[in-house]
């Protein structure tokens, strides 16, 4: 069910239309649902979920991560800097979400839904941001070669990459959700 169309909304016809913040909040929760389903399939299929963090850290994927300097943590919180980081991070994740598209058998539609919902989330956030000039869009050529490189990995590395992407994307969305609720 797309966000904003769940049974709660249907059951409460007097409810005000969703605000921009509520829509973003709901969208993130919807994507987190999708990630949860994809992680289930990944964990059932391989033992990657039991891998130690040290082993995972060896993988040289440059996945976006929140740091204190990004303005999303309570100490040094800066709404505009944080918003730019969230949008930039999501744009950087897009190539990894593209990589996930052919990685699932029973959850193929779920993988597509996560990808599409993330595009919608980016649009919502861009409307909220004042300083769009500060947002750097990843280079398409770099993304294309990264995608080719990831798809050329052996099976074990592809499983590891899939697991890492899902875990990191979940963490990034949770950090974003937390920060957005403070705005």
């Amino acid at each position: 069910v797309p966000p904003g169309e769940d049974s709660k909304d249907v059951a409460a016809p007097h409810r005000q239309p969703l605000t921009s913040s509520e829509r973003i909040d709901k969208q993130i929760r919807y994507i987190l649902d999708g990630i949860s389903a994809l992680r289930k399939e990944t964990c059932n299929k391989s033992n990657m979920c039991e891998s130690s963090k040290e082993a995972l850290a060896e993988n040289n994927l440059n996945l976006p991560k929140m740091a204190e300097k990004d303005g999303c943590f309570q100490s040094g919180f800066n709404e505009e800097t944080c918003l730019v980081k969230i949008i930039t991070g999501l744009l950087e994740f897009e190539v990894y979400l593209e990589y996930l598209q052919n990685r699932f058998e029973s959850s193929e539609e779920q993988a597509r839904a996560v990808q599409m919902s993330t595009k919608v989330l980016i649009q919502f956030l861009q409307k909220k941001a004042k300083n769009l000039d500060a947002i750097t869009t990843p280079d398409p050529t770099t993304n294309a070669s990264l995608l080719t490189k990831l798809q050329a990995q052996n099976q074990w590395l592809q499983d590891m990459t899939t697991h890492l992407i899902l875990r990191s994307f979940k963490e990034f969305l949770q950090s974003s959700l937390r920060a957005l609720r403070q705005m």
């Epitope: 509520e22 949860s36 943590f73 875990r167 963490e171 949770q174 937390r178 609720r181 403070q182």
Partner: antibody
Framework: QVTLKESGPTLVKPTQTLTLTCSFS??????????VGWVRQPPGKALEWLAF???????YYSPSLESRLTITKDTSKNQVVLTMTNMDPVDTATYYC??????????????WGQGTLVT | DIQMTQSPSSLSAFVGDGVTMTCWAS??????LNWYHQRPGEAPELLVF???NLQIGVPSRFRGSGSETYFTLTINSLQPEDSGTYFC?????????FGGGTKLEI
Amino acid sequence: QVTLKESGPTLVKPTQTLTLTCSFSGFSLSTSGVGVGWVRQPPGKALEWLAFIWWDDDKYYSPSLESRLTITKDTSKNQVVLTMTNMDPVDTATYYCARSADDYLYYSFDTWGQGTLVT
Amino acid sequence: DIQMTQSPSSLSAFVGDGVTMTCWASQSINDYLNWYHQRPGEAPELLVFAASNLQIGVPSRFRGSGSETYFTLTINSLQPEDSGTYFCQNGHSFPLTFGGGTKLEI
């Protein structure tokens, strides 16, 4: 099985610093979406949230007590420490540590320690 | 800060009765509202999270509802062990805030 236990002094003199330790098991504070908070309750009164620390070391404090509080974590030891400076008789309360852990960050405390009474 | 107000501050009922208590938030918190039950001398226990989701192990006679600024906790077919104080909590944003509590006497 998730458990948390508070430890620290039961008696503190005015102006002294209170140091409370929350030792936990059954979960890891390096898992995304997981956090540990401190809540206190003066005798016969309501619950009052004090501080919170997340898996990624993001920290939040009660605005009215922020200048007196420090929360830290030691992930390898499975411990969270709260320090509260300049203690006063009005700080007499049962101090609880509690865990929050869900994908959507509902900030709900699903497991609590037994509490420690500090006078 | 988001203020949480609970009503009534106390109520008494008989075993088998049903009761409803309310919680207001000073601004919209969507469905980020949690309910706890505390017996004297014990730690609080999570009953309901996200306004209407029952925590695992909580009997189905408990029901949470509401959204935005108005929330209710209903207990049907009261049992002796339901006595104690019920607290609501803002789970939307920091600082986290609790209501003053509703004391239930059976």
